[in-house]
Structure formats: structure tokens, C-alpha cells
């Protein structure tokens, strides 16, 4: 049944689409932008815990003018998926639940077998999304390559296909700052630099807080990241503008440690007003 | 090390040359922005290595407005905006590294204290 007059099942399974996607919601995916070559997707790793791989498989006659030549039922139709070390299988979704295949992976989630029907009938067309965990992607990962192979016990020669994406490591860091207070006032009399003994002699105090947030996974390889603050210490003629008293980094050094920033502030060695800290 | 600005004795101040004098007495309503990115101020860059963190790191910087400079240079100005900028940089051999929205601008407004009497 479903094998034409010659009773030989000559299927025509085709993987007509294999493209990487961003997961928007549980069953909604958006294709990644393409590289200039038009065949490689661009994946920015910015805290996305998963990437989707959209797969569309058809079993249609190769020549609509000769529909009996092939496109017969594909018995024990399967899609075999080989994942790189950087990706791990986490699930499968389909917009239409009736198109969701049964996908089972090996223990380390590097190899997946999806059952596409027994048989996958003549004229069938299914679209589904493999959900792949990106937790294995490191800063050294430059490319994702997933090898895909359709299989059937029906008569058909099948060859592996690769889906590729170029990886950009988009560090999921954001920065925000605030000044306390946001308005300052000056008054009094002019005093020379040498007359300054304590920071209170200098002028109105101001505190800046700059927060760096990491919205993604823990960044293990941030040994070469720096938080920089451009501090306007003088006006164009070289006179003091904002005098830096103290610079302290909290949270970038490991538990409970205060970070050292360079250069050191308070180069005039003015007395610190402890009430201001 | 951070070099201190050129020091002058209290009584030895030179008259400013017009090339950088911020305002004339006829421009008492002027608003000025002091920003290193625009060349209207000079900056020292404090750089803090982020060795490792999971969620957030906070940089605290305490400073003082140099009162005398403002009295000398900007007492006739309506308002000044002083800009502090901060960013994250990553030094890496990795070519495919990208940082988006990794900078911020922190403005502070500075005014002559309305209660003050400035000694000419």
C-alpha cells in the first residue's frame, strides 16, 4: 500500500529546509539573519539559552509530470541529527502538534533520532523545530555545524546535509550609571591647590555609581574585560574640574573582594572625609 | 600615575587667553557642557579589570567639584553640564567577540549657588 503499481516503495524524502532560528516563545521561532554568503546563519550568543533548528521534510514526487516514479510512502522514515560539542539536544516543537515527531537523544544529547512516520506518506510535508541548548558554546566557538541525515527502508539514496551558523559572541553585558546628587553647586572664595588639606576644602561632593550587569550565563573567560570610567579631571586649560578621591570596584573580583582600579585617585593625598563614605 | 594639573600659587594666576576663556561678561546666560568626548574637558581613564562575575559589578567613584576653578572660570555661566562616561572594553584575540550597549553617559548639572556672593 502506498508504493505504486510496481509495489516497490521509491520514496523521495527531501530536507527542503534546515535553518537556525531564535526562539521567541514556546512554539514560535524566527530565522537568524544570514551572512553575506546567503547560506550561513549569524548567531549572536547574548544570553540565549537555546537555539532553534527549523527542519522541513517532504515526501513529494521529484517530477510532478511523472508522479509514479517516486514519492511513494517512506517506511520507517527518520531524521538523524549529529550535534557538535557546543550544542545539546533539549526538545522538539511544531506549530501544529500533529507534526511534532518523536525525537529521542542519546545520553549526552549529542545524537538525535526523529521518527517522521511509519510510513511518511506520499505527499506528506512536515515542519518542526529542534531546540538545542547553547550551554556548550564558549568564547572560542566560531561556528555551529549540525549534520542531518534522512533515512528510510524504502528505496532511496540519501546523503547527509549540514546546517551552519557563524557564531558571534555577543557578551551579554550592559552598563548603567548614576550620579548622587545630580545637581551640584559652587560658591565661596578661590583657594589655591596648596591650600587644600582635606577633601572638604575642594568643593561639593559627588558620588558616581556604575553598574555592569551580566544578563547571560556566567562569563568564565572574562580575564581581559575592563570597566573604564572617563573622568573629567580638568578643563581645557589644565585647571582641576572634578577631583577624584576614591575609586572602588565591587563584585568583579570574586566573592567579597574589592577591586583595584588604575591609576590611583587622590594624587594630592587629601584627607578623606570618612563621613562621606 | 595621574599627573596633577599645572599648579599655580593663589596669587600668581595668569589672565586667561581668549582662546579658551569660557564666557565673556556679556554672555551671562550661557549653558556650557564639559565633556572629554567633545574636547571641552580632559579626562583621566580609571580602568578596573573585571576578573569574574555572574550578575553585577558596581564601580563607586567619589569625587569633589573643584570649587575654585568654577568660581574663576564659570561664575558668569547660567549652568554647566559635566559629563562622565563609562564603558566596558574587552581585550581578546577572539575575532568574533561583540559588545553591544556597553557604554553609558552620566551627566551632572553644576550651578553657581544662588546664595553665594562671589568675591571679584
Amino acid at each position: 500500500q502506498g508504493c505504486g503499481e510496481d509495489k516497490i516503495c521509491q520514496s523521495n524524502l527531501q530536507l527542503v529546509r534546515a535553518r537556525f532560528c531564535t526562539r521567541v516563545s514556546d512554539t514560535e521561532f524566527q530565522p537568524l539573519p544570514m551572512d553575506v554568503d546567503g547560506t550561513t546563519a549569524l548567531f549572536a550568543l547574548s544570553g540565549q539559552p537555546v537555539i532553534g533548528l527549523e527542519l522541513m521534510v517532504t515526501n513529494l514526487p521529484s517530477d510532478p509530470a511523472q508522479p509514479q516514479a517516486d514519492g511513494d510512502d517512506a517506511h520507517e522514515a527518520q531524521l538523524l541529527v549529529m550535534l557538535p560539542d557546543s550544542l545539546h539536544y533539549s526538545g522538539v516543537r511544531a506549530l501544529d502538534p500533529a507534526e511534532k515527531p518523536l525525537c529521542l537523544s542519546n545520553e549526552n544529547a549529542s545524537h538525535v533520532e526523529c521518527e517522521l512516520g511509519n510510513p511518511m506518506k506520499r505527499g506528506a510535508q512536515v515542519t518542526f523545530y529542534l531546540i538545542l541548548s547553547t550551554s556548550g558554546i564558549s568564547i572560542e566557538t566560531t561556528e555551529l555545524e549540525v549534520e542531518l541525515l534522512l533515512a528510510t527502508i524504502s528505496e532511496q539514496e540519501l546523503h547527509p546535509v549540514s546546517a551552519r551558523a557563524r557564531v558571534f559572541i555577543e557578551l551579554p553585558l550592559s552598563i548603567a550609571g548614576m550620579a548622587i546628587p545630580q545637581q551640584l553647586f559652587f560658591s565661596g572664595v578661590v583657594r589655591g591647590e596648596r591650600a587644600m588639606q582635606s577633601e572638604r576644602d575642594v568643593g561639593s561632593k559627588v558620588k558616581y555609581e556604575v553598574t555592569v550587569s551580566n544578563q547571560g550565563q556566567s562569563l568564565r573567560t572574562l580575564g581581559s574585560a575592563f570597566l573604564n570610567i572617563m573622568w573629567p579631571h580638568e578643563i581645557a586649560n589644565g585647571k582641576w574640574l572634578l577631583y577624584p578621591m576614591q575609586v572602588e570596584l565591587e563584585g568583579g573580583q570574586g566573592p567579597g573582594q574589592k577591586g583595584l582600579c588604575s591609576p590611583r585617585p587622590n594624587i594630592l593625598h587629601l584627607d578623606v572625609d570618612s563621613r562621606d563614605r | 600615575e595621574l599627573e596633577p594639573p599645572e599648579q599655580q600659587e593663589p596669587g600668581e594666576r595668569q589672565e586667561p587667553s581668549m582662546s579658551w576663556w569660557p564666557v565673556s561678561s556679556a554672555e551671562k546666560k550661557k549653558n556650557i557642557t564639559l565633556d572629554c568626548a567633545r574636547g571641552t574637558a580632559n579626562c583621566v581613564v580609571f580602568s578596573c579589570p573585571l576578573y569574574s562575575f555572574d550578575r553585577a559589578a558596581v564601580l563607586h567613584v567619589w569625587g569633589r567639584l573643584w570649587n575654585s576653578t568654577f568660581l574663576e572660570e564659570y561664575s558668569a555661566v547660567k549652568s554647566l553640564e559635566v559629563i562622565v562616561r563609562a564603558n566596558i572594553t574587552v581585550k581578546s584575540s577572539i575575532k568574533n567577540l561583540m559588545l553591544r550597549d556597553a557604554s553609558t553617559v552620566i551627566p551632572v548639572m553644576v550651578y553657581l549657588d544662588p546664595m553665594a556672593v562671589v568675591a571679584e
Partner: antibody
Amino acid sequence: EVQLVQSGAEVKKPGSSVKVSCKASGYSFTRYWMHWVRQAPGQGLEWIGKIDPSDSETRLNQEFRDRATLTVDKSTSTAYMELSSLRSEDTAVYYCARGGYFGEQWYHDVWGQGTLVTVSS
Amino acid sequence: DIVMTQSPLSLPVTPGEPASISCRSSQSLVHRNGNTYLHWYLQKPGQSPQLLIYEVSNRASGVPDRFSGSGSGTDFTLKISRVEAEDVGVYFCSQSTHVPWTFGGGTKLEIK
């Protein structure tokens, strides 16, 4: 023999929650969706939703979206249905039922014996 | 949601006589994959429902051949060629083409 064995009857107060279990045996638990259907006394059947034990995807009837939670424990081949904010209209027999994949066996071929949940103050 | 309407509500039948139950859906039950997901269940008194017919006309395993299903699109029929005493219970039609899956109100078959 393929079997679905459900937990025993429950009496609950309005506003509380109930969690019904369904232990599967005799087949590969992750190869079939698990559905939940309820039947109020003397009434018809109402589909609550289904869960895919292989990756815990759930599809719920919109009517139950805010109150029903479907979960599975693959290690014990057990499916669970929790219904919160119970009201008297939730008094019913709750069934788990096995369903197939990929538009094949897209029906309930094996049913549990049912769990009577009575909601009464 | 798809509304499944069954008729009659009650069906008294003499043993050995044929019986027919109708099920009408508010929308076509032909899925875009070509399958029609219309099924019939029987719930015997005090028991859980059991599958009788799946996808319009396929008998579930162990179901006697006196049960048959037919129909297409939105109109479907369950026929029992010769009713036996053990066939009493409530018959439900059900659709799984559209989410949520829905059931008919049921037809109670009783022996005269």
C-alpha cells in the same frame, strides 16, 4: 500489558489545589503524549490538555491555561495533573489517557481508571 | 473550539437490530496532512471510556467487526450491524484535528 494507574479519590475545599498522578507501565513512557480528560457527574468528556514526556512540552485547553499544570517524572514513568483554585464545578472524574505522536495514534487508545475529585466546603 | 453535536441523545435498541449514531462537527475535520481525526469511544457503565473507531473508519484492536464508522468533512456515522447486550453504554465522538480536542455530548445506547 499497557496500563495507566491513577491515584485515589480526593475531597478538596474550594480554593485549594489537587494533584492527580498517573503511573504508566507496559510501554515506553516517552514515546506517547499523556492526555488529561475530565467528566463531571452525568456529563460528557472535556479535554484538559496533554504533555509530551520526552521534553515536557504541554498543550492546554485555553479554559484551563491559568489553573492546570501538567508535569511528568520520567524516572518513575508517572504523569501528574495539578488543578488549582478549585471550585464546585471542578467536581469530576479525572482521566489520564495515552495519545500518539506525529498525527499517528492521534487518539486516546489507553485510559486510566479515573480519579474522582470532589470539591465541597 | 470545534463543537461536536451527536444525535440521538438516547437510543433504545432491540438486541440483534442495527443501530446508527450521527456526529456533526462545526468545522471540517480534515487536517492539512490529509488525515481526518474523528474517533468514537464507548463508555460502559462504571468504566473508563474505551476506543472503538479511530480516524473515521478504523476499528481499534479487539473491537468486533459489527462496529463500523463512516463519513467525511463534517458528517460522521457510527453503525452497529447487530446490537448485543454488552454494547450498552454512552458513545462519544471526538475530534483531534483542532486544538483543543473536543468530544460530542454522548449518545446513550440502551437495550429495549
